[in-house]
């Protein structure tokens, strides 16, 4: 196997590799650097495998997975070294590296010259306590919003910054706004930002007016 | 800081058993492999045995297979090998390491010394 | 088992020389390499793993390049500090040791 690769977002996280196996099969290791491997997809004809469950139990470990080849029908195989054949993926730190999903607006509300515009705080696959947390339980205040929001007029944006999931914003009366949104956490040095959200309009059906 | 700090060589006569220990602090012992490598005087290093974070996979080389049993104890932060029907042979400086992944030793302790002679 | 050669066994250098160590494996091992220092009586210090990530703290004059079977450690101007034994270990499969080279003052 070649091209090990992770793709994670929000914590949904996926080993890729090549090639497309014609007469074998893999089997997929992962551990933390305890070197307790754990088994996963074993002897699959698939060229992914899913690791969210194995690396939920704790994002801020780095892990290292690797995929063992096997002939078909032999799962004994093994190298010239009297081992099964296989390769190493690259480290991966899920709280440092798993990409920031698209973010959505769930509201927006105007009262006067003020708007509370609130981001959907997204559910991941990470458990505490039987229950599945979100991206802000998760990351708390490593992890900020960014609120892009122009009038509707015009097409000169301006920002504002949370670490919370709400934006309050003062607004001109009268004007109709649009709003979009996009993840950011600051420490990172890699997939520090999302992709933005879709814009909202004021006038549509996500928000409320009141005088 | 890291530190690891092994105890227990001393001279032991063929045949005779030995238990090395490595005292373990800075870090969360239980997340990290360990492993001890040797070097016989004016030798080079030679890799002995790992054992994973939880003990549940252990690791030994040919020359030591079936003498020698790596153990560990997360509640000490101790690892140990205990070294039985030892040789002449097996006369080296042992240092315990902490090894990530199993794969390579980022922290060496000082090492302890094994003599084995009549 | 996989060998690990290292070549010369011993180099004479001075300082602010460019030395360069040479590690052969007896067959692939991708990039999983490590490379130490040690000094007499003294235990191994990680350099480099991986073949080239330089380990935290370790001066940027070291780097290490290669993958499969043929690697070296490279030191860009050598330092009174240097002067010591280097260990090249393959973690490809289990773990084996090359046999050091000693870098001594020329």
């Known amino acids: 196997a070649f091209n090990l690769t992770w793709i994670s977002t929000d914590f949904k996280t996926i080993l890729e590799w090549q090639p497309k196996p014609t007469n074998y099969t893999y089997t997929v290791q992962i551990s933390t650097k305890s070197g307790d491997w754990k088994s996963k997809c074993f002897y699959t004809t698939d060229t992914e495998c899913d690791l969210t469950d194995e690396i939920v139990k704790d994002v801020k470990q780095t892990y290292l997975a690797r995929v063992f080849s096997y002939p078909a029908g032999n799962v004994e195989s093994t190298g010239s070294a009297g081992e099964p054949l296989y390769e190493n993926s690259p480290e991966f730190t899920p709280y440092l590296e798993t990409n920031l999903g698209q973010p959505t607006i769930q509201s927006f509300e105007q009262v006067g010259t003020k708007v509370n515009v609130t981001v959907e705080d997204e559910r991941t696959l990470v458990r505490r306590n039987n229950t599945f947390l979100s991206l802000r339980d998760v990351f708390g205040k490593d992890l900020i919003y960014t609120l892009y929001y122009w009038k509707s007029s015009s097409s000169g944006k301006k920002t504002a910054k949370t670490n919370t999931n709400e934006f309050l914003i003062d607004v001109d009366k009268g004007e109709n706004y649009c709003f979009s949104v996009q993840a950011v956490i600051p420490s990172r040095t890699v997939n520090r930002k999302s992709t933005d959200s879709p814009v909202e309009c004021m006038g549509q059906e996500k928000g409320e007016f009141r005088e | 800081e890291v530190q690891l700090l092994e105890s227990g060589g001393g001279l032991v006569q063929p045949g005779g058993s030995l238990r090395l220990s490595c005292a373990a602090s800075?870090?969360?012992?239980?997340?990290?492999?360990m492993g001890w490598v040797r070097q016989a005087p004016g030798k080079g290093l030679e890799w002995v045995s790992t054992?994973?974070?939880?003990?549940?996979?252990?690791y030994y080389a040919d020359s030591v297979k079936g003498r020698f049993t790596i153990s560990r104890d997360n509640s000490k932060n101790t690892l140990y090998l205990q070294m039985n029907s030892l040789r002449a042979e097996d006369t080296a400086v042992y240092y315990c390491?902490?090894?990530?992944?199993?794969?390579?030793?980022?922290?060496w302790g000082k090492g302890t010394t094994v003599t084995v002679s009549s | 088992d996989i060998q690990m050669t290292q070549s010369p066994s011993t180099l004479s250098a001075s300082v602010g020389d460019r030395v360069t160590i040479t590690c052969r494996a007896s067959?692939?091992?991708?990039?999983?390499l490590a490379w130490y220092q040690q000094k007499p009586g003294k235990a191994p210090k990680l350099l480099i793993y991986k073949a080239s990530s330089l380990e935290s703290g370790v001066p940027s004059r070291f780097s290490g390049s290669g993958s499969g079977t043929e690697f070296t450690l490279t030191i860009s101007s050598l330092q009174p500090d240097d002067f010591a034994t280097y260990y090249c270990q393959q973690y490809k499969s289990y773990i084996t040791f090359g046999g050091g080279t000693k870098v001594e003052i020329k």
């Open positions: 067959q692939s091992i991708s990039s999983w």
């Open positions: 800075g870090f969360t012992f239980s997340d990290y492999a």
């Open positions: 390491a902490k090894a990530p992944y199993g794969y390579y030793m980022d922290v």
């Open positions: 054992i994973s974070g939880s003990g549940g996979l252990t």
